[in-house]
């Protein structure tokens, strides 16, 4: 239904708190360099304006679109060109081009310092002084670093943050209460960020149809008792919600997500038997819970997939009559039978099925041609299964840090031209798949591993797009989203790469490394490892292990020494010489 004032409508639907949070996220994701105070001022102005429109929808400018209102606010910021360069050119455009322009200038890797958590006492003091400002800072800092973070989900994480602080700041030992809980939220939020970025990439690069296919597969796995019409309705609604969030329409997105959650809870009988617990929760928790609800029990009497899609003489007729519906039905039927497959794999199978029909339905005897299609799925299924087994075995043998190092070596060999910080970040993230997925029951491993890896590799592609340096990476990133992970897995050592010359300073360390937190120490060591591989791309695992063990021993010795500086300056050059010899 059309509303006289869009801003008044959204303010009424969302309520002041969520409205302000979402506007803050929107501004922080568009203008990532502005301070919290600058954005907070704009948010207050927008909120005050929204209230005037609630009081009188016919008031001046209340009929303007949200893009117009928000864009005008952003374009009125002083020193826009000095701070944002060519982004200021967006302000010369009219809507909808202006918003598109803002979207194109979102930076997936902004040059902002890592978000440092203050120590417990300081955090509790500022939280108690002004919880609203404290949470505003959290939203601002996360949103500007993650310009595609799913806005309603970020409100959920802020709520989690709030609850943890409320609980832990009342404890005697605030630190030991806060640290593990906030680490947990941070880890979940980071995974949420890369997953959502993948969805926006799918939408941006391949359009709504591609995202809807992803949604059909995912929803069919989770709700195998829902019929195809129900799954299609949910997928259509979910596509709309994600399109809005990816497009910067955060108020509409959050509002429609709340509507979708309401619909699901009102229609549990036709969707799933597992929704009640989620539906008893308040809005943000409810929507979050529904997004990761456990799979419903599969119906016991599902016929074999072959009956309708292989053995039926009418396959080509049904395909010709409504290609998308027929393929959608296939994806639905296959996915509801396979909660143990990744969405990426299900989409590859649907693509294979479509290609088979395209080829076979053009033949004189189609049934004879497409009759073997299910057998042709086998290698597509075996490949990711083998990947999971190999990698989980390696993870169990090496632990997370060792597994990250193995991946780092592998990926540096595949794409040695990529910058070391990007390789280290990617390897650390890819390596976390072990901890995240390999401990799960067998039937949950494959979907967890492959869909997580796909999201991480999407980030690798986004970073590489900014400064393309590797033909290997370009090749894998320019293909379809579901083929990326198999493409990266299949890459071998880049034979075109000219090894980097050995620079002693790259492997020279100082005593300050001793006081770094464990994570930072690991990153330093992994940086050195990537540089070693760039120097000797064909070094054996044994050679690299020797060097890294020597390196770890050197750090351990010097960090325990009475005179650390002397130890580093005398033993360091010896280590460098030994490294060169070991790799010769």
């Amino acid at each position: 239904e059309a509303h006289k004032s869009e801003i008044a409508h959204r303010y009424n639907d969302l309520g002041e708190q969520h409205f302000k949070g979402l506007v803050l996220i929107a501004f922080s994701q568009y203008l990532q360099k502005c301070s919290y105070d600058e954005h907070a001022k704009l948010v207050q102005e927008v909120t005050d304006f929204a209230k005037t429109c609630v009081a009188d929808e016919s008031a001046a400018n209340c009929d303007k679109s949200l893009h117009t209102l928000f864009g005008d606010k952003l374009c009125a910021i002083p020193n826009l060109r000095e701070n944002y360069g060519e982004l200021a050119d967006c302000c010369t455009k009219q809507e909808p081009e202006r918003n598109e322009c803002f979207l194109q200038h979102k930076d997936d890797n902004p040059s902002l310092p890592p978000f440092e958590r203050p120590e417990a006492e300081a955090m509790c003091t500022s939280f108690k002084e002004n919880p609203t400002t404290f949470m505003g800072h959290y939203l601002h800092e996360v949103a500007r670093r993650h310009p595609y973070f799913y806005a309603p989900e970020l409100l959920y994480y802020a709520e989690q943050y709030n609850e943890i602080l409320t609980q832990c700041c009342a404890e005697a030992d605030k630190e030991s209460c806060l640290t593990p809980k906030l680490d947990g939220v941070k880890e979940k939020a980071l995974v949420s960020s890369v997953r959502q970025r993948m969805k926006c990439s799918s939408m941006q690069k391949f359009g709504e149809r591609a995202f809807k296919a992803w949604a059909v597969a995912r929803l069919s796995q989770t709700f195998p008792n829902a019929d195809f019409a129900e799954i299609t309705k949910l997928a259509t609604d979910l596509t709309k919600v994600n399109k809005e969030c990816c497009h910067g329409d955060l108020l509409e997105c959050a509002d429609d997500r709340a509507e979708l959650a309401k619909y699901m809870c009102e229609n549990q009988a036709t969707i799933s038997s597992k929704l009640q617990t989620c539906c008893d929760k308040p809005l943000l928790k409810k929507a979050h819970c529904l997004s990761e609800v456990e799979h419903d029990t599969m119906p016991a009497d599902l016929p074999a997939i072959a009956a309708d899609f292989v053995e039926d003489q009418e396959v080509c007729k049904n395909y010709a009559e409504a290609k998308d519906v027929f393929l959608g039905t296939f994806l639905y039927e296959y996915s509801r039978r396979h909660p143990d497959y990744s969405v990426s794999l299900l989409l590859r199978l649907a693509k294979k099925y479509e290609a088979t029909l395209e080829k076979c339905c053009a033949e004189a005897n189609p049934p004879a041609c497409y009759g073997t299609v299910l057998a042709e799925f086998q290698p597509l299924v075996e490949e990711p299964k083998n990947l999971v087994k190999t990698n989980c075995d390696l993870y169990e043998k090496l632990g997370e840090y060792g597994f990250q190092n193995a991946i780092l070596v592998r990926y540096t060999q595949k794409a040695p031209q990529v910058s070391t910080p990007t390789l280290v970040e990617a390897a650390r993230n890819l390596g976390r798949v072990g901890t995240k997925c390999c401990t799960l029951p067998e039937d949950q491993r494959l979907p967890c591993v492959e869909d997580y890896l796909s999201a991480i590799l999407n980030r690798v592609c986004l970073l590489h797009e900014k400064t393309p340096v590797s033909e290997h990476v370009t090749k894998c990133c320019s293909g379809s989203l579901v083929e990326r992970r198999p493409c990266f897995s299949a890459l071998t050592v880049d034979e075109t790469y000219v090894p980097k010359e050995f620079k002693a300073e790259t492997f020279t360390f100082h005593s300050d490394i001793c006081t770094l937190p464990e994570k930072e120490k690991q990153i330093k060591k992994q940086t050195a490892l990537a540089e070693l591989v760039k120097h000797k791309p064909k070094a054996t695992a044994e050679q690299l292990k020797t060097v890294m063990d020597d390196f770890a021993q050197f750090l351990d010795t010097c960090c325990k020494a009475a005179d650390k500086d002397t130890c580093f300056s005398t033993e360091g050059p010896n280590l460098v010489t030994r490294c060169k010899d070991a790799l010769a």
Epitope: A320, C361, A362, P366
Partner: nanobody
């Protein structure tokens, strides 16, 4: 919406010829193999002939071999069946179908072979 409209049927004496046409719309005609099937009075559906999307490959039931020729014009999105040396047992309603389908969704065209 997929539409198939057959024409060209009629009453013909044994030994004579007929050419059936099927005008297709609502789908990418050249991407699909097409078939002719028939249903004689009081009998079940019987496959007659099929042709690939490009027109390069054709298949025939034993009862049609040597007498019938299937062809297509992708520019006109039309399927044809040239029937020579017609016999009384060729009397049936003839339908064109997509792919290997044996369940017609069209009206068909009646061919009656009688002296």
């Amino acid at each position: 919406k997929v539409q198939l409209v057959e024409s060209g049927g009629g009453l013909v004496q044994p030994g004579n010829s007929l050419r059936l046409s099927c005008a297709a719309s609502g789908f990418t005609f050249s991407s699909f193999g097409m078939s002719w099937v028939r249903q004689a009075p009081g009998k079940g559906l019987e496959w007659v002939s099929s042709i690939s999307g490009s027109g390069s490959d054709a298949l025939y039931a034993d009862s049609a071999k040597g007498r019938f020729t299937i062809s297509r014009d992708n520019a006109k999105t039309t399927l044809y069946l040239q029937m020579n040396s017609l016999r009384a047992e060729d009397t049936a309603v003839y339908y064109c179908t997509i792919g290997g389908s044996l369940s017609p969704s069209s009206q068909g065209t009646l061919v009656t072979v009688s002296s």
